[in-house]
Interface confidence: medium
């Protein structure tokens, strides 16, 4: 329950009255305003718009509202020289070009400054080649095409579709197998669902949609020139050789149309299964090169992007607490957009803008919270989470020593079927509480809590009656406070029916369709989901800043801590001979696992206890629960991923969207039977198996009585 | 609900020339390729020419070729198919079509203009 008694307010300044004053109205007209221009980063409309929020923000009653910038590495394309993908005959003659442009949505014709489809932080070069059609250039895809059919991808241009993993990813398998190009393509069984009309008759992308999108593979290093530190006006920057993270080879996006031309031809290997073919009608044929009469033509790119150095601006409000000021709670969202940003991030910075006029309200009134909400609207996130991650750099030795928590906003929706939540195992009954008192939005659950319809809708795969919350992967920002400094965080949407839409995302995903309009006609005409989703989030925020005790609970990380040992066990296990011959043991790890939940439970019932009027042993229970998550931190990092240091989690290393539980054991048996060094590979398994023992063991003992 | 009407069919002599017109109506038409396809009288269904969404790329059956010009008016949803130097072997009855490129995703069909190339 939440407890105001600290903060000396009226009865009448709750979470009731900050729910309250939470309008769907407002989100709207929030989201129409913000969505009216493009907000690409870098680009003098979006420091306008900076300037618009943190203007906004001061006037809703925030204590200060600060612009905060730095000069990171951008990409765009060469306005006089645009990108393109051709077929090319024996003589070199460009038989077919690809779209320069999206046919822009009614009503957005005469609109300047829509970035052409591209793929941010491409390197230039003009390679032509044969085509290798590579399904979505999983690591898995890249297993079936070189192992099983001896295809060579050396030299070749490939062709990718999206979906599933993280674009960047597929780059870097591509580049791995020796692609000397990459086209990614948005196929209709991934992005269009049946019996769903196109844009802007539906929601469903048109042949000529396109998917832009970073392709980087920075692994939470923030700006690529600036590892580690803020890109400020003193940073030392990196040259472009040693930057991190950048693509080696093109790479260049395109819709299905432009795809048909290019699949349609290809000869060589069928498919290997079912699970290769889209729903395009060509035979999704491998390759290399394309079929009989016409196996003298090749693919082109074209490209001829730039990487500049460019300023971004987060906005960060503070809102200060009145008992604990030195301690943060976090709700962070991204501005910038690839074009209008209909949902992503619009739909999230409107609610985060109404989740602030809310708390300003209150504020104005006398109240404040107990400890201190920091705000932010972050820039360049589209670019590789640059802003929130340049901030958090600048600011590490605050937030590492005061953060309490970090709630995530970017996109409110993905779909309109139920709600989605990730988060750190520390907050689950903080969500489940929370969901409890909010009403579900969804037809058919009228009068019934948000935690019913979610239940029902998306049931938990192991505790019934419980609904299903997901581990943190990446993506998004709140990556640097997770991954990086050990902050609890945590993210809520709403989101599709899984069952039914096996398409990846949202159809019109990062394309010039995602309007306002969208979202308005198609996803959430009356905005209660936005509504639902500005009360999750907000309300997920002012218990954290306001109850007297943090409302983390220490067992359900214990429970999660042996679902994880247990499959990583049964991961290993599935080498028997090996784990004999090397003598590998999991005993250290089940020990540390059971005596943190030993640990976690008596600290438990201490808290239940404890003299809540001492503001000494008030402060002594909190920090040990605020550092809990900080003890999952390892200061040196995953193997060579030194900004990924949190040993319980990290983004999967075959897709950064993906959280992997104990990552350093994982990574140390994937594909382990391949390695050339059988005693080598195994004993890293076993000095990961000690990393993530002693982390455990370490982080319990600072549940344990302080003396 | 789709429609697509098509108009300016006739009777021509060898060698002149018509020009069919099809309206559409009840989807976007910008973001469709669109299709000539025509049956003639007793023969099974040929593809004649298709265009892409946005009027860049044409494509010709062999025996239409340098004769016969697909375009499309995207701001007045039209499609067009300019026919010169037209023979007796091109009378059937043609069709505007919007095929889908998508497995399982319908086709639409207009009812169709009758093209009779006689002297």
């Known amino acids: 329950k939440s407890s105001n008694e600290a903060t000396n307010i009226t009865p009448k300044h709750n979470m009731k009255a900050f729910l309250d004053e939470l309008k769907a109205e407002n989100i709207k007209k929030f989201l129409y305003n913000f969505t009216q221009i493009p907000h690409l980063a870098g680009t003098e409309q979006n420091f306008q718009l900076a300037k618009q929020i943190q203007s906004q923000w001061k006037e809703f009653g925030l204590d200060s509202v600060e612009l905060a910038h730095y000069d990171v590495l951008l990409s765009y394309p060469n306005k006089t020289h645009p990108n393109y993908i051709s077929i090319i005959n024996e003589d070199g003659n460009e038989i077919f070009n690809t779209s320069l442009f999206e046919p822009p949505p009614p009503g957005y014709e005469n609109v300047s400054d829509i970035v052409p489809p591209f793929s941010a932080f491409s390197p230039q070069g003009m390679p032509e080649g044969d085509l290798v059609y590579v399904n979505y250039a999983r690591t898995e895809d890249f297993f079936k095409l070189e192992r099983d059919m001896k295809i060579n991808c050396s030299g070749k241009i490939v062709i990718a579709r999206y979906g599933k993993v993280f674009r960047g990813n597929k780059v870097k398998n591509a580049q791995l197998a020796g692609a000397k190009g990459v086209i990614l393509y948005s196929d209709p069984a991934d992005y269009f669902a049946p019996g769903v009309k196109s844009y802007p008759d539906g929601w469903n992308l048109p042949g000529g949609g396109v998917q832009r999108g970073n392709i980087l593979n920075l692994n939470g290093a923030g700006d690529p020139l600036t590892p580690g530190y803020p890109a400020n006006e003193y940073a030392y920057r990196r040259g472009i050789a040693e930057a991190v993270g950048l693509p080696s080879i093109p790479v260049h996006p395109i819709g299905y149309y432009d795809a048909q031309k290019l699949l349609e031809k290809m000869g060589g290997s069928a498919p290997p299964d079912s699970s290769w073919r889209g729903s395009l009608k060509v035979p999704y044929n491998v390759g290399p090169g394309f079929t009989g009469n016409f196996s003298t033509q090749k693919v082109k790119m074209h490209i001829h992007s730039t990487n500049e150095v460019t300023r971004i601006y987060n906005v960060i409000g503070t809102l200060r607490g009145a008992v604990e000021p030195d301690r943060y709670v976090i709700l962070g969202g991204h501005r910038d957009s690839w074009v209008f940003g209909g949902i992503d991030p619009q739909s999230g910075a409107a609610v985060v803008h109404e989740i602030v006029r809310s708390f300003g309200t209150l504020k104005k009134e006398g109240w404040r919270p107990r400890r201190t909400i920091l705000f932010a609207s972050w820039d360049a996130e589209e670019f590789g989470l640059l802003g929130s991650t340049e901030w958090a750099e600048e600011n590490s030795r605050l937030l590492q020593e005061r953060g309490v928590a970090y709630i995530n906003a970017d996109s409110s929706i993905e779909g309109n079927y139920t709600l989605r939540v990730d988060c750190t195992p520390l907050m689950y009954s903080l969500v489940h509480n929370l969901t409890k008192e909010l009403k579900s939005p969804d037809e058919g659950f009228e009068g019934k809590s948000l935690y019913e319809s979610w239940t029902k809708k998306s049931p938990s795969p192991e505790f019934s009656g419980m609904p299903r919350i997901s581990k943190l992967g990446s993506g998004n920002d709140f990556e640097v406070f997770f991954q990086r400094l050990g902050i609890a965080s945590g993210r809520a949407r709403y989101t599709k029916n899984w069952e039914t839409n096996k398409f990846s995302g949202y159809p019109l995903y990062h394309s010039v369709y995602e309007t306002y309009e969208l979202v308005e006609k198609f996803y959430d005409p009356m905005f209660k989901y936005h509504l639902t989703v500005a009360q999750v989030r907000g309300g997920m925020v002012f218990e954290l800043a306001n109850s007297i005790v943090l409302p983390f609970d220490c067992r359900d990380y214990a429970v999660v801590l042996r679902k994880y040992a247990d499959k990583i066990y049964s991961i290993s296990m599935k080498h028997p001979q090996e784990m004999k011959t090397y003598s590998v043991s999991f005993d250290s790890l089940f020990s540390a696992v059971k005596n943190f939940t030993e640990i976690a439970s008596k600290f438990s019932e201490r808290l239940q206890d404890f003299d809540k009027s001492n503001p000494i042993v008030l402060r002594m229970m909190n920090d040990q629960l605020m550092f809990l998550e900080r003890a999952f931190i390892d200061p040196l990092g995953l193997p060579d991923r030194p900004f990924y240091r949190h040993v319980i989690y990290a983004p999967s290393s075959h897709n950064k969207y993906a959280g992997e539980s104990f990552p350093g054991i994982y990574d140390a048996l994937f594909d382990i039977e391949s390695k050339v060094d059988p005693s080598k590979a195994w004993g890293e398994v076993k000095r990961q198996i000690y990393v993530a023992a002693f982390t455990v063991q370490a982080a319990a003992e600072t549940l344990s009585e302080v003396a | 609900e789709v429609q697509l009407v098509e108009s300016g069919g006739g009777l021509v002599q060898p060698g002149g020339s018509l020009r069919l017109s099809c309206a559409a109506s009840g989807f976007t038409f910008s973001s469709y390729w669109m299709y000539w396809v025509r049956q003639a009288p007793g023969k099974g269904l040929e593809w004649v020419a298709n265009i892409n969404h946005i009027g860049s790329e044409k494509y010709y059956v062999d025996s239409v070729k340098g004769r016969f010009t697909i375009s499309r008016d995207n701001a007045k949803n039209s499609l067009y198919l300019q026919m010169n130097s037209l023979r007796a072997e091109d009378t059937a009855v043609y069709y505007c079509?919007?095929?889908?490129?998508?497995?399982?995703?319908?086709?639409?069909w207009g009812q169709g203009t009758l093209v009779t190339v006689s002297s």
């Open positions: 079509a919007r095929d889908s490129l998508i497995v399982g995703e319908r086709g639409y």
